[in-house]
Interface confidence: low
Amino acid sequence: LIIGFGISGRHSITVTTVASAGNIGEDGILSCTFEPDIKLSDIVIQWLKEGVLGLVHEFKEGKDELSEQDEMFRGRTAVFADQVIVGNASLRLKNVQLTDAGTYKCYIITSKGKGNANLEYKTGAFSMPEVNVDYNASSETLRCEAPRWFPQPTVVWASQVDQGANFSEVSNTSFELNSENVTMKVVSVLYNVTINNTYSCMIENDIAKATGDIKVTESEIKRRSHLQLLNSKAS
């Protein structure tokens, strides 16, 4: 969490941002909140990015003002206009690109004063893994697949019964480049699976950590997956 204050003493307002990660090709949110004003027309929101000449986004007098917007963001940004009045200056970024990563500044002007806070935005690709029993294999194996990751993640298998066991000798992981030549499909196979056990396939890079669990018993197979972003820090 980053909390910024205006530069000039009594004419300062508190602006708060939260570091976050964007999944390339999808839409992302750059979070920013501020002390609200009672008049929408008195609020100016400017989003800037370090190293970029033009603005990322500007909202003033109750509407978007995009004539000074940098070309790399044109047609891809929006604020939540109906929430500005309650102090939400968060920016929606469409079709996140790798090059969108960097330091952003959320700069706010209201009738109460000015304030700003920086936000670190990481970009990459992350997706939920799915673990299945691989019935094509000669012996009982598990197959963990996740369609989109970048940068290349690590894959670790774990089991509930054999806690602390190292499965690297009995697993094989491959990374297949996707058609857009950036993200990769992750496939990991675990051999010599025993029944009445729960196995976890953990995929992690510096942006996200995702886990796919599978419980294998004689009578049923249960699956569960979850994904966690690693760098969501507030400022």
Epitope: L53, G54, E58, D64, E65, L66, S67, E68, Q69, D70, E71, M72, R74, G75, R76, N95, Q97, T99
Partner: antibody, heavy 120, light 108 residues
Framework: EVQLVESGGGLVQPGGSLRLSCATS????????MSWVRQAPGKGLELLGF??????????EYSASVKGRFTMSRDNSKNSLYLQMNSLKTEDTAVYYC???????????WGQGTTVTVSS | DIQLTQSPSFLSASVGDRVTITCRAS?????MHWYQQKPGKSPKPWIY???NLASGVPSRFSGSGSGTEYTLTISSLQPEDFATYYC???????????FGGGTKVEIK
Amino acid sequence: EVQLVESGGGLVQPGGSLRLSCATSGFTFSDYYMSWVRQAPGKGLELLGFIRNKANGYTREYSASVKGRFTMSRDNSKNSLYLQMNSLKTEDTAVYYCARDSHRTYFDYWGQGTTVTVSS
Amino acid sequence: DIQLTQSPSFLSASVGDRVTITCRASSSVSSMHWYQQKPGKSPKPWIYATSNLASGVPSRFSGSGSGTEYTLTISSLQPEDFATYYCQQWSSNPPMYTFGGGTKVEIK
């Protein structure tokens, strides 16, 4: 050095078609919005449309005067911009320019222009 | 859609004169760009983002304005300044670049 060079202009009959090309060099073509602008004899500048960059999915916008008749495209492997003009009218007679958006909503580089004459 | 109206359309002036060209937008815009064009040549970027001179543009040129009215001023007209000047802006809704009709600066 940034360069934009148009070609493909000429004399065409009303109702005919023509394809203009704009070969570019000296910059990363896929990073930029590219536009076509024309200028009828003795008249002002008229934007025909533009095609966005890679980050914005190469989507296109057209002015009302040419929508449905003209099609813009780009070949990023060849660093080239194209304008396919169909159902040409006499009022399409003009010098046609390709132009690069500077990242700041104005055109920082223009081609030398290619002349299209629509006449029977 | 935003329309840009330039005035005057034609302007006769002498070397050394102070010249002002106006561009009016049909609704408020936050910046304006200007181009210079000479006969048989491509337009050249002249002033961008209301008041910034493009590379190589002499300091006798200046730009100003806000809202719906923008101006290009030449403090002391020189022989090489005789040309046509166009204003231009970017509108995001609908997304489009718009040009003014042009102002031709001629020798008196």
